[in-house]
């Protein structure tokens, strides 16, 4: 059996607008007053179990007390009315939950979309948070007929229960209602066919053309409400390894179609495609992108000949020389296909030319000491590149004309080389480089540069603190010119070890010190200078600086009969390194001198 409460709070379900004032009253029953020997002055108001200050409370009469709250901000408060029975025992009379929030804002930005194969979905912006239970109802009607209401679960969207009818305008609006008010959005009027988002095109396929290596043909299947809609397309593509998409101009794909030829592509390159569609009027929504499909353009003949150079080995006997023809594999962007082989043709004036078919990137031939012309072409499935031509002069011909002002310098983690061209028209330049070392042979790498180039960087994988010997050779129609060389570092470091000093000659007051140059493998940079530090066991240390071209130095004004400690350091642009300490003692007397 439920006990009757001793009184009631009014209102029983209070909802307050945030920031406003609110008053509640507690009315005690007569029977309660008599039973507990109390009146309204015995009432204690509490919010969330905390007593309300007396200033907020008013005793209206012997049965009724009121409490007033100003600027209500808490979203939910437990408000209780309690009495002090027998002057000290607190007894709960009644309790209510006081909610605060806002009336709904007028919904804005109402939009609807018909996802193909699904019912219509409408979305809106409900405005500010109400903090209260708020019902959003999507209303829709024709001029003559109402459709079932759509009760929103989330307050920002609703999917209607009926299938859309196309080519008839519909009116749609949203009603929002909570305990503090009710409001309607502006209505929108549209034909559902103009709100369609088609399903993505599917079965996208890509085929190439043997006739044209710059095109790929696309074909796909569009839905468009089972052919009810004419759709235009949006096509994007990228190379397989690229991250950014290239847009086919939309004006090229405006008319309804299910195939398209993409042009101006690179030969023998894999491209990835995607496609989406929209109603050809442009109304409605773009479909999601189709699944990606890829295809590779057909091969084309190589767009340029390989870089081409030669090295001559010393002749075995006087009549013949061994010539190693060398070339670089073409990058994919120039090979335009799989290189099957290379064709080398050797010719001489009024002689039978001979053709070699080579799969590698070098060919060694025994040639006489006469002048030859070698040509090189790369071949793929489609055809041959243009030929690179090299004149191999007689070894008895002295090469004239070389580059001048040859310089090398590191910049942006690359080793740059620049020069001034010779005064005679050049066909191309050859740059050769290798690591100088006393422990290993100089294994050369090389690259070719066009005649117009006079500044470039070395394209190999270079190491820091290694000394590179760089050679630049201009190549003319008549053959190679003279070669110019220099040394350079990609990045210097302090030497790996310092010089080992020794005495060459020691006198009473001077000593000639000598040292060997640091081996190139330990230099780690250009040795700019040396420092010699010397001291006695009691005296202060003296330091002299010596130019890097020297390998000996005379210390003067030394004390006789004294032990000296000497140490030498070598410096590059990046710092120095000490060598081992060395000691020597000056004699008491000069030669021929007696005590």
């Amino acid at each position: 059996q439920l006990l009757e409460p001793c009184g009631y709070i009014y209102p029983e379900f209070p909802v307050v607008q945030r920031g406003s004032n609110f008053t509640a009253i507690c009315v005690l029953k007569e029977a309660c007053l008599q039973h507990y020997y109390v009146n309204a002055s015995y009432i204690v108001w509490k919010t969330n179990h905390a007593a309300v200050p007396r200033e907020q409370v008013t005793v209206i009469n012997r049965t009724t007390s009121s409490v007033t709250f100003t600027d209500v901000v808490l979203p939910s408060v437990q408000l209780t009315c309690n009495i002090l029975s027998f002057g000290q025992i607190e007894q709960n009379v009644y309790g209510v939950t006081m909610l605060s929030g806002f009336p709904p804002d007028k919904p804005t930005n109402l939009t609807c979309i018909v996802n193909e194969g699904k019912n219509m979905l409408c979305q809106w912006d409900p405005g500010r948070e109400t903090y209260l239970e708020t019902n959003y109802t999507l209303k829709s009607e024709w001029a003559t007929e109402k459709f079932p209401d759509c009760q929103s679960k989330h307050g920002t969207s609703c999917m209607v229960s009926y299938m859309p009818t196309y080519y008839v305008n519909i009116e749609v609006w949203v009603e929002a209602e909570n305990a503090l008010g009710k409001v309607s959005s502006e209505s929108i009027n549209f034909d559902p066919v103009d709100k369609v988002k088609p399903t993505p095109p599917y079965n996208l396929s890509v085929t190439n053309s043997e006739e044209l290596s710059s095109i790929l043909k696309l074909s796909w299947v569009s839905s468009g409400l089972g052919g009810l809609l004419d759709l235009k397309s949006d096509i994007q593509y990228r190379t397989k390894d690229a991250s950014t998409w290239i847009q086919v101009p939309l004006e090229d794909t405006m008319s309804p179609r299910t195939s398209f030829t993409v042009q101006d592509l690179k030969p023998f390159t894999e491209y990835v495609f995607r496609i989406r569609s929209i109603k050809d009027s442009g109304k409605g929504y773009w479909s999601d992108w189709s699944e990606e499909a890829s295809g590779t353009t057909y091969e084309d003949r190589p767009s340029r000949p390989p870089s081409f150079w030669y090295k001559t080995n010393p002749s075995h006997g006087q009549e013949y020389r061994s010539v190693r023809l060398i070339w670089k594999a073409l990058p994919l962007s120039e090979a335009n296909g799989k290189i099957l082989d290379y064709e080398v043709i050797l010719t001489q004036s009024k002689s039978v030319s001979q053709t070699y078919t080579v799969t590698g990137t070098e060919l060694t031939v025994n040639l006489t000491n006469d002048r030859y012309v070698a040509s090189l072409a790369a071949r793929n499935k489609v055809g041959k590149s243009a030929a690179a031509v090299l004149t191999i002069p007689s070894p008895h011909v002295t090469a004239a004309y070389s580059v001048v002002n040859l310089k090398a310098f590191p910049k942006d983690n690359l080793l740059w080389v620049e020069w001034t061209p010779p005064p005679k028209p050049v066909s191309k330049y050859i740059l050769e480089w290798c690591v100088l070392s006393e422990n290993a042979p100089c294994v050369e790498d090389w690259q070719q540069e066009d005649a117009t180039v006079n500044r470039t960087h070395l394209r190999g994988r270079l190491l820091e603190s290694k000394c590179y010997q760089i050679t630049v050779t201009p190549v003319f129609a008549t053959g190679p010119g003279g070669s110019e060389s220099l040394k350079a570092y990609l990045k210097q470091a302090a030497p790996a070890r310092g010089p080992t000093v020794r005495t060459k000659k020691v006198g009473k007051n001077e000593a000639v010190l000598a040292w060997d140059q640091i081996p190139v493998d330990d230099q780690n940079g250009f040795i700019r200078n040396y420092s010699i530090s010397y001291r006695t066991s009691v005296g202060k240390e003296m330091v002299v600086h010596v130019d890097s071209s020297h390998t000996e130095y005379t210390l003067s004004s030394l004390s006789s009969d004294t032990l000296y400690m000497v140490r030498m350091a070598a410096y590059t642009d990046e710092g120095g390194k000490d060598g081992p300490e060395f000691t020597f003692t000056t004699p008491k007397f000069a030669q021929g001198e007696i005590e």
């Epitope: 001489q348 001979q354 006489t368 006469d370």
Partner: nanobody
Framework: QVQLQESGGGLVQPGGSLRLSCAAS????????MSWVRQAPGKGLEWVSA????????YYADSVKGRFTISRDNAKNTLYLQLNSLKTEDTAMYCC??????????????????WGQGTQVTVSS
């Protein structure tokens, strides 16, 4: 300047013989392989035979194998072709040709030309 002068051609009956010579100048004859080629009326150039620079290796087209013999005398800068058992289909202009290396390699492709004036061989009854 390379110069090649052929001689020794003439009119001969089927089954007969001829000896063709090629006098070379303007280059170190002993350093280069040499070939004989021929051109029949209205036909293209056909390689006949080759010999390496030292004379130790010789090569022949199937159509003349066993009938023709190539040789050289490096001291005289002269190339020879002995033609035996001649057939009417051997009728052609015969030329000698200088290679660009000392060896003839049958696996390579060669581009022949007649740089001399050639010598005419006519086999007819």
């Amino acid at each position: 300047q390379v110069q090649l002068q052929e001689s020794g051609g003439g009119l001969v009956q089927p089954g007969g013989s001829l000896r063709l010579s090629c006098a070379a100048s303007g280059f170190t004859f002993s350093s280069y392989a040499m070939s004989w080629v021929r051109q029949a009326p209205g036909k293209g150039l056909e390689w006949v035979s080759a010999i390496n620079s030292g004379g130790g290796s010789t090569y022949y087209a199937d159509s003349v194998k066993g009938r023709f013999t190539i040789s050289r005398d490096n001291a005289k800068n002269t190339l020879y072709l002995q033609l035996n058992s001649l057939k009417t289909e051997d009728t052609a202009m015969y030329c000698c040709a200088k290679h660009i290396t000392g060896d003839y390699d049958p696996s390579l492709r060669y581009e022949y030309n007649c740089w001399g004036q050639g010598t005419q061989v006519t086999v007819s009854s």
